[in-house]
Amino acid sequence: LEVQVPEDPVVALVGTDATLRCSFSPEPGFSLAQLNLIWQLTDTKQLVHSFTEGRDQGSAYANRTALFLDLLAQGNASLRLQRVRVADEGSFTCFVSIRDFGSAAVSLQVAAPYSKPSMTLEPNKDLRPGDTVTITCSSYRGYPEAEVFWQDGQGAPLTGNVTTSQMANEQGLFDVHSVLRVVLGANGTYSCLVRNPVLQQDAHGSITITPQRSPTGAVEVQVPEDPVVALVGTDATLRCSFSPEPGFSLAQLNLIWQLTDTKQLVHSFTEGRDQGSAYANRTALFLDLLAQGNASLRLQRVRVADEGSFTCFVSIRDFGSAAVSLQVAAPYSKPSMTLEPNKDLRPGDTVTITCSSYRGYPEAEVFWQDGQGAPLTGNVTTSQMANEQGLFDVHSVLRVVLGANGTYSCLVRNPVLQQDAHGSVTITGQPMTFAAAHHHHHHHH
């Protein structure tokens, strides 16, 4: 029996679903009762999924596999693998037996894109031409191992004095850290390119270093006292201003934005021009307003990881600096309500009501109420689970003994946005049935 699979490996991104194609040619009069289909790991012979005795025997592989049952009779024995993990990488054998039998193996190549590199410089202050600095290029959560290339501002390769290390994280994805040691010239741009060899995906990072003259005295730099609140995915303006003296020209200005804690360069304007973003290419200055003393920074597509303090450093002849805080926020989704058990309920039964609200930031506060609006505090367990982006999914579980009928409401509050999202479940009747209701979120004042 001829079994056909693709010659090339199937490439699947971590977290997505993959189809391992396999087909055979059924003879006229073929029926599924005759078919034995077995998918197994080629090396270990571990069973993955099977169809025997005329029916799907189900997944033997972490409940993440499925057959295309409606296509089996036409000879499509392909396997769907859900939520691909690094550990799934390898060879899968498709074994088909009718009267004759045949088998073929298909390779699964798992991949994950690398993040935009973050660049750090050490030391990062009081730099002079001729100083030796260490530039670290870090890119996260990719697979398989990355290739890293360094270039100067002219695009010429920098090969000397580079040490590249790959660190596997808890999921088996790789963080790559490449360290370049270089002697500073008058100024220079250093770029690193992180390549995923399977996806042929390149992620670029660069840093421009301008050694400073020795400043003296003080420039008054003003920033807002209160944190700037920004929604995930939106753009934020970190306001910063200084008072230019008469006759001030941009050629005199050194403006540096950096992360307060780590001193990582975020954006700079030196030598009369914008040196660009050193922060994942998501920052910009208001160049047409700089001459009037507006040194504000625009941060695009805000992420949870951006939260923290940013320092605005202004040097003309004198210098000054001030720090502005960024508070990141994301609204919680309308809660979904589930009830367990959810049939044949009687008054006096103990049930578990779960209220789940997704992708918010920072952590939520959850409140439960009965139909009269009275708080329900006993037997509540609330868990916050951070997802890949650092946003939180909140799951609050209420255990309650049913009365004759009742409404149970949960309120999920975002403490920064003062946003409330409501969900409720009503349990009525004999035997009791339930209906879940969701309310659009609103802002609480």
């Epitope: 990488e89 260490t134 191992e145 596997a168 994280n169 360290v179």
Partner: antibody, heavy 117, light 111 residues
Framework: EVKLVESGGGLVQPGGSLKLSCAAS????????MSWVRQTPEKRLEWVAS???????YYPDSMKGRFTISRDNARNILYLQMSSLKSEDTAMYYC???????????WGQGTLVTVSA | DIVLTQSPASLAVSLGQRATISCRAS??????????MHWYQQKPGQPPKLLIY???NLESGVPARFSGSGSGTDFTLNIHPVEEEDAATYYC?????????FGGGTKLEIK
């Protein structure tokens, strides 16, 4: 010649703190990931922490929060700040230079930490 | 966490014979590119010393009588021919995912 010399070990009471140091020489310190590994009295080896640069660190869950790894590239020194120490933290603590895929290529002679009342 | 189980816990081998130490991982520590398993030797009063990295690569300065093999979950350190100075405890370590863990050690005695 790569040389790693640990110091700062000693006797400390449960709940106490200690800061270990490791002086490195014979290689370009700032270019390498550095790590701490400990060996218990039963001779079990346990990875404690690794540091890429001042803001990039790795720990096992069991050490997070209590232990902080840091480095001073100007002085070629690696540190391990340990707090809320428990008797289970009693061990020989080794400083190690990590290889490019998280093996431990060079080790110091170790410094002994004893946590006991 | 990936658990590494070494066997035997101790063994005695005659001078000039082969010593074989096994390390089994609770899940695969290999990718299509590399096996993230490393071997160390430790003598009393000394720190561990790297012998083999990435399953089969001999560290610079380590004698060629040491060799490593294996992939996936099963790895082996071979010493042949065994010499007097090889009496030590041998450890395996993986770096496939956090946290990086070590095996419990195998003590080699020379008869």
């Amino acid at each position: 010649e790569v040389k790693l010399v640990e110091s700062g070990g000693g006797l400390v009471q449960p709940g106490g703190s200690l800061k270990l140091s490791c002086a490195a020489s014979g290689f370009t310190f700032s270019s390498y990931i550095m790590s701490w590994v400990r060996q218990t009295p039963e001779k079990r080896l346990e990875w404690v922490a690794s540091i890429v640069s001042s803001n990039i660190t790795y720990y096992p869950d069991s050490m997070k929060g209590r232990f902080t790894i840091s480095r001073d590239n100007a002085r070629n020194i690696l540190y391990l700040q340990m707090s809320s120490l428990k008797s289970e933290d009693t061990a020989m603590y080794y400083c190690a230079r990590s290889g490019t895929r998280a093996w431990f290529a060079y080790w110091g002679q170790g410094t002994l930490v004893t946590v006991s009342a | 966490d990936i658990v590494l189980t070494q066997s035997p816990a101790s063994l005695a081998v005659s001078l000039g014979q082969r010593a074989t130490i096994s390390c089994r991982a609770s899940k695969s520590v290999s990718t299509s590119a590399y096996s993230y398993m490393h071997w160390y030797q430790q003598k009393p009063g000394q720190p561990p010393k790297l012998l083999i990295y990435l399953a089969s690569n001999l560290e610079s300065g380590v004698p060629a009588r040491f060799s490593g093999s294996g992939s996936g979950t099963d790895f082996t350190l071979n010493i042949h021919p065994v010499e007097e100075e090889d009496a030590a405890t041998y450890y395996c370590q993986h770096s496939r995912e956090l946290p990086y863990t070590f095996g419990g050690g195998t003590k080699l005695e020379i008869k």
